[in-house]
C-alpha cells in the first residue's frame, strides 16, 4: 500500500481536483475509496467494511479490507478510504520483526536490570542495567520474579556482559 | 495498427524525440504505452499516457522522458539519452483490464559517440 | 513500483513435452496479468489477459492460471514454433505501481 502515488507525488499538471463523487477518472486516476472501471472509463466505489483504497489510483479492484486477529482489538473499523486499524491486546505487542502476531510482553526485567518502559501494544517492557544504564535488548528468560540461583552460583541465563 | 518511428543514431545527451502513429482506433479513446528492449534483454516498461493525456512513468524513466500526445500520434522525448538507452522503442495500445494488446514494430534508438 | 519475479529464465523441452513457467508479483493483482510470447526481430504478442483469458487466435494449448502474487503459464504439446521468450506484465494500477514485466524466460523446444 506504501506504493500508492498520493497527489502530492503527481507532477502539479497531473494533480487531480479531490472531488470525492466523481464517476469518472480524474487524469487517469480514481480518487480514495474507489478503482478503475476494466475499461478505465469509471471510477467505481470500494464496498464499506470489504475492502478500499486511500490513494488516487488506477487500480482495477479495491484493497481487501484487514480482519483483526483473535489476540486483537479493533481501533477503528474499515472504511472505503482506510483499513481497519488493529492493536494487540493489553499485556502483548507486536515487534516490527515479527508483525504477524502479537507476543506476551514480559513480566519483569533479568537480575540487575530495572525496568524503566511498560509494556504497550507496540513494544515490550525495556530493561536497562542498574549501574550502566544500557538498554537490554538480548531476550532472557529468567527474570526477577523467576531467579531462583543460590548466592555463588552464577544464574548462566543472565550472565551478560554490559 | 500502430508504427513508431524516428529511430536513429545520436550521440550522447542530444534530445530525440520518437513519434508513434496509430491507425484504425482513436486514442482519445486509449491509454498508449511505451515499452524498450535492449539488444539481447527484456522488456522493459518505460510509461505510458491516458486517454485524456496525463503521463505516468516507470521510477526509473522519470525525468529522462517525456511521453506526449496529439490526436493522432503519441511522442516519446528521450531528454539526454545516454549509451545506456540504446534499445529498440515499442509503442503499444494499452487496454487497462486487458494488457498491451497491439504493438508496433519498433524504431531502434542507437546512442554512440 | 511493482517487481514481478519469473521463473525460469531458461527451459528446453522436447517438441510435445510441456513447459511450465512461473511468475511471481511482489503485491496483489488479483488476477490483472497479462502474458505475451517473443519472437528474435519481432514485437510481443499478447497470448493471455486477465490471468487466464486466451487472446484472439491464441491456441488452447497455452493455459493460464493463478490470481494474487502466484502466476503461471503452461504450454503443453510443445511445437516448434512455440520456441520464444515468454514475459508477464501486471494490467492492474500502472500509474500506480508500474507496470514492470517479468525478466523473461526463453523457451528452446528440442
Known amino acids: 500500500e506504501s506504493a500508492l502515488i498520493t497527489q502530492q507525488d503527481l507532477a502539479p499538471q497531473q494533480r487531480a481536483a479531490p472531488q470525492q463523487k466523481r464517476s469518472s477518472p480524474s487524469e487517469g486516476l480514481c480518487p480514495p475509496g474507489h478503482h478503475i472501471s476494466e475499461d478505465g472509463r469509471d471510477c467505481i466505489s470500494c464496498k464499506y467494511g470489504q475492502d478500499y483504497s486511500t490513494h488516487w489510483n488506477d487500480l482495477l479492484f479495491c484493497l481487501r479490507c484487514t480482519r483483526c486477529d483473535s489476540g486483537e482489538v479493533e481501533l477503528s473499523p474499515c472504511t472505503t478510504t482506510r483499513n481497519t486499524v488493529c492493536q494487540c491486546e493489553e499485556g502483548t505487542f507486536r515487534e516490527e520483526d515479527s508483525p504477524e502476531m502479537c507476543r506476551k510482553c514480559r513480566t519483569g526485567c533479568p537480575r540487575g536490570m530495572v525496568k524503566v518502559g511498560d509494556c504497550t501494544p507496540w513494544s515490550d517492557i525495556e530493561c536497562v542495567h542498574k549501574e550502566s544504564g544500557t538498554k537490554h535488548s538480548g531476550e532472557v528468560p529468567a527474570v526477577e520474579e523467576t531467579v531462583t540461583s543460590s548466592p555463588g552460583t552464577p544464574a548462566s541465563p543472565c550472565s551478560l556482559s554490559g | 495498427s500502430v508504427e513508431e518511428s524516428g529511430g536513429r543514431l545520436v550521440t550522447p545527451g542530444t534530445p530525440l524525440t520518437l513519434t508513434c502513429t496509430v491507425s484504425?482506433?482513436?486514442?482519445?479513446?486509449?491509454?498508449m504505452i511505451w515499452v524498450r528492449q535492449a539488444p539481447g534483454e527484456g522488456l522493459e516498461y518505460i510509461g505510458f499516457?491516458?486517454?485524456?493525456?496525463s503521463a505516468y512513468y516507470a521510477s526509473w524513466a522519470k525525468g529522462r522522458f517525456t511521453i506526449s500526445k496529439t490526436s493522432t500520434t503519441v511522442d516519446l522525448k528521450m531528454t539526454s539519452p545516454t549509451t545506456e538507452d540504446t534499445a529498440t522503442y515499442f509503442c503499444?495500445?494499452?487496454?487497462?483490464?486487458?494488457?498491451?494488446?497491439?504493438w508496433g514494430p519498433g524504431t531502434l534508438v542507437t546512442v554512440s559517440s | 513500483d511493482i517487481v514481478m519475479t519469473q521463473t525460469p529464465a531458461s527451459v528446453s523441452e522436447p517438441v510435445g513435452g510441456t513447459v511450465t513457467i512461473k511468475c511471481q508479483a511482489s503485491?496483489?493483482?488479483?488476477?490483472?496479468l497479462s502474458w505475451y510470447q517473443q519472437k528474435p526481430g519481432q514485437p510481443p504478442k499478447r497470448l493471455i489477459y486477465?490471468?487466464?483469458t486466451l487472446a484472439s487466435g491464441v491456441p488452447s494449448r497455452f493455459k493460464g492460471s493463478g490470481s494474487g502474487t502466484d502466476f503461471t503459464l503452461t504450454i503443453r504439446d510443445l511445437e516448434c514454433a512455440d520456441a520464444a521468450t515468454y514475459y508477464c506484465?501486471?494490467?492492474?494500477?500502472?500509474?500506480?505501481?508500474?507496470?514492470?514485466f517479468g525478466g523473461g524466460t526463453e523457451v528452446v523446444v528440442k
Open positions: 503499444a495500445r494499452y487496454t487497462y483490464s486487458d494488457g498491451t494488446d497491439l
Open positions: 484504425g482506433f482513436s486514442i482519445s479513446r486509449y491509454a
Open positions: 499516457i491516458t486517454s485524456d493525456s
Open positions: 503485491q496483489s493483482i488479483s488476477t490483472y
Open positions: 486477465k490471468a487466464s
Open positions: 506484465q501486471p494490467n492492474s494500477g500502472i500509474a500506480t505501481y508500474g507496470a514492470a
